[in-house]
C-alpha cells in the first residue's frame, strides 16, 4: 500500500530515509529548464525479490528548449549541493536497512534532476530527522516515523523531536558531519471527505479533486 | 467554436507539490483520452500532440488549484473533462463537461 | 507512441462468474500499467497499479498480472457492483495512453 501523504512536518527539521521499501516510487522529477527525454521514464520504482531489490529504470532529463537526450552522469559538486535530499550511506546506521532484503538504497543523482526529490512511500517505511543547521535536538523519543496501515488507512507516526535554536546540529544515526540545510517542504492540507466506495468499504478518502470551469470568447 | 475554455480543477487532503495533475476527456460515448500533465512542483508539463498549441496547462500553489486551457474550440471538443492525481490517477475530480454548439 | 489493445471489447456475465480481461501493449512498458473501472456517468476509478498492486480500499477478488507487453486483470466472484467500463492504461512513459475499454455487462 502506498502512504497516503508525505511524513510529517517538524519544524527546522528535515527526514530521509535510510533505505527505501519495494513499492516505493521516485518521481522522475528535472529541474526549471529541464524536462524527461522524449519516451523517458516518468517515475523509478524499488522493484525486485527477496534475495535483491533495485530500481528498476532511471530518471533521465534534457534540456527543454532542445530534443537532446542528456547522459546518465553524476553532477558536479556545486550541482550536488542543491539536491535538498543528500545521499547518507554511512556504514554506521544502526541498522544497515539498504543491506536489508526487500529494499533499495537511495538511487544516484541523475544529471539536471530537480532540487527536492519526490517519493511516494509505501506502508512499512521509516524515516529519520535531523535539525536543521542552527538548531539542536531535544529529543522526546525516537526521532523517526513510519507508516502504519490502520482500520484501511495509512498514517505516519509522530517522532518525538524538538529542534530548539541553538547554534549546535543534531545528526542523522551514524553520520559525522551535518548536511546543509535544506527548507522543509510545503505543509500539507488535513482536510478529508469520508466516504462509502463502490465496493462497500468504509474508506478514508485523503485526497479529493473538484473542477469547475470558466468559458471565454474570443472578441 | 473557436471560443476558449478554462476548466479549474483544486485538490485537497494532500500536499499538492508532491504530485503532478494529470488531464483527460471523454467524449460522449467514447473511451478515455489522455490530455497531458502537469508538475506541481515545478510546472513542467507535457501534452498530448494533437492537442499541442491549443492547451495550456498551469498550477497555483498558493491554493492547490491546477487549471486547463483548451483553445480554439471545436465541435470535437465536446466531452467531460477530469482532472487526476499525477499520472498514477489515483484520485479523479467529478468531471466537467464542455460543449461546443454553433 | 504506445497502443493499448484490450480484450475482448465487451461481455456479459453473471453475478458469481469469473471475469479475465486482457491488455497488450505495443512496446515493452514494465510493470506501468493500471487498471480502472468506470460505471456511466461516473469519473474512473483505480483498481489496480503497477500491474499487480491493488489501490486502497479496492477487494481482493480483483488481480492483476503480466509485465512487458502482455498483462490480465482477473475479477473473481463478479459482484453487482463491478459492472461498468474497465480501461487499462500505461504509466510507462508520456504520452500516456488508455485501451478502448472492455464493457462488462449483465447477463
Known amino acids: 500500500e502506498l502512504c497516503d501523504d508525505d511524513p510529517p512536518e517538524i519544524p527546522h527539521a528535515t527526514f530521509k530515509a535510510m533505505a527505501y521499501k519495494e513499492g516505493t516510487m521516485l518521481n522522475c522529477e528535472c529541474k526549471r529548464g529541464f524536462r524527461r527525454i522524449k519516451s523517458g521514464s516518468l517515475y523509478m520504482l524499488c522493484t525486485g525479490n527477496s534475495s535483491h531489490s533495485s530500481w528498476d529504470n532511471q530518471c533521465q532529463c534534457t534540456s527543454s528548449a532542445t530534443r537532446n537526450t542528456t547522459k546518465q552522469v553524476t553532477p558536479q559538486p556545486e550541482e550536488q549541493k542543491e539536491r535538498k535530499t543528500t545521499e547518507m550511506q554511512s556504514p554506521m546506521q544502526p541498522v544497515d536497512q539498504a543491506s536489508l532484503p526487500g529494499h533499495c538504497r537511495e538511487p544516484p543523482p541523475w544529471e539536471n534532476e530537480a532540487t527536492e526529490r519526490i517519493y511516494h512511500f509505501v506502508v512499512g517505511q521509516m524515516v529519520y530527522y535531523q535539525c536543521v543547521q542552527g538548531y539542536r535536538a531535544l529529543h522526546r523519543g525516537p526521532a523517526e516515523s513510519v507508516c502504519k496501515m490502520t482500520h484501511g488507512k495509512t498514517r505516519w507516526t509522530q517522532p518525538q523531536l524538538i529542534c530548539t535554536g541553538e547554534m549546535e546540529t543534531s545528526q542523522f544515526p551514524g553520520e559525522e558531519k551535518p548536511q546543509a540545510s535544506p527548507e522543509g517542504r510545503p505543509e500539507s492540507e488535513t482536510s478529508c471527505l469520508v466516504t462509502t466506495t463502490d465496493f462497500q468499504i468504509q474508506t478514508e478518502m485523503a485526497a479529493t479533486m473538484e473542477t469547475s470551469i470558466f468559458t471565454t470568447e474570443y472578441q | 467554436p473557436g471560443s476558449s475554455v478554462k476548466v479549474s480543477c483544486k485538490a485537497s487532503g494532500y500536499t499538492f507539490t508532491s504530485y503532478g495533475i494529470s488531464w483527460v476527456r471523454q467524449a460522449p460515448g467514447q473511451g478515455l483520452e489522455w490530455m497531458g500533465w502537469i508538475s506541481a512542483y515545478n510546472g513542467n508539463t507535457n501534452y498530448a500532440q494533437k492537442l499541442q498549441g491549443r492547451v495550456t496547462m498551469t498550477t497555483d500553489t498558493s491554493t492547490s488549484t491546477a487549471y486547463m486551457e483548451l483553445r480554439g474550440l471545436r465541435s470535437d471538443d465536446t466531452a467531460v473533462y477530469y482532472c487526476a492525481r499525477d499520472f498514477r490517477m489515483d484520485v479523479w475530480g467529478q468531471g466537467t463537461t464542455v460543449t461546443v454548439s454553433s | 507512441d504506445i497502443r493499448l489493445t484490450q480484450s475482448p471489447s465487451s461481455v456479459a456475465s453473471s453475478v458469481g462468474d469469473s471475469v479475465t480481461v486482457t491488455c497488450r501493449a505495443s512496446q515493452d512498458i514494465k510493470r506501468r500499467l493500471a487498471w480502472y473501472l468506470q460505471k456511466p456517468g461516473q469519473a474512473p476509478k483505480l483498481l489496480i497499479f503497477?500491474?499487480?498492486r491493488l489501490h486502497t480500499g479496492v477487494p481482493s477478488r480483483f488481480s492483476g498480472s503480466g509485465s512487458g507487453t502482455d498483462f490480465t486483470l482477473i475479477i473473481n466472484s463478479l459482484q453487482p457492483e463491478d459492472f461498468g467500463t474497465y480501461y487499462c492504461?500505461?504509466?510507462?512513459?508520456?504520452?500516456?495512453?488508455f485501451g478502448q475499454g472492455t464493457k462488462v455487462e449483465i447477463k
Open positions: 492504461q500505461q504509466a510507462n512513459t508520456f504520452p500516456q495512453t
Open positions: 503497477d500491474a499487480s
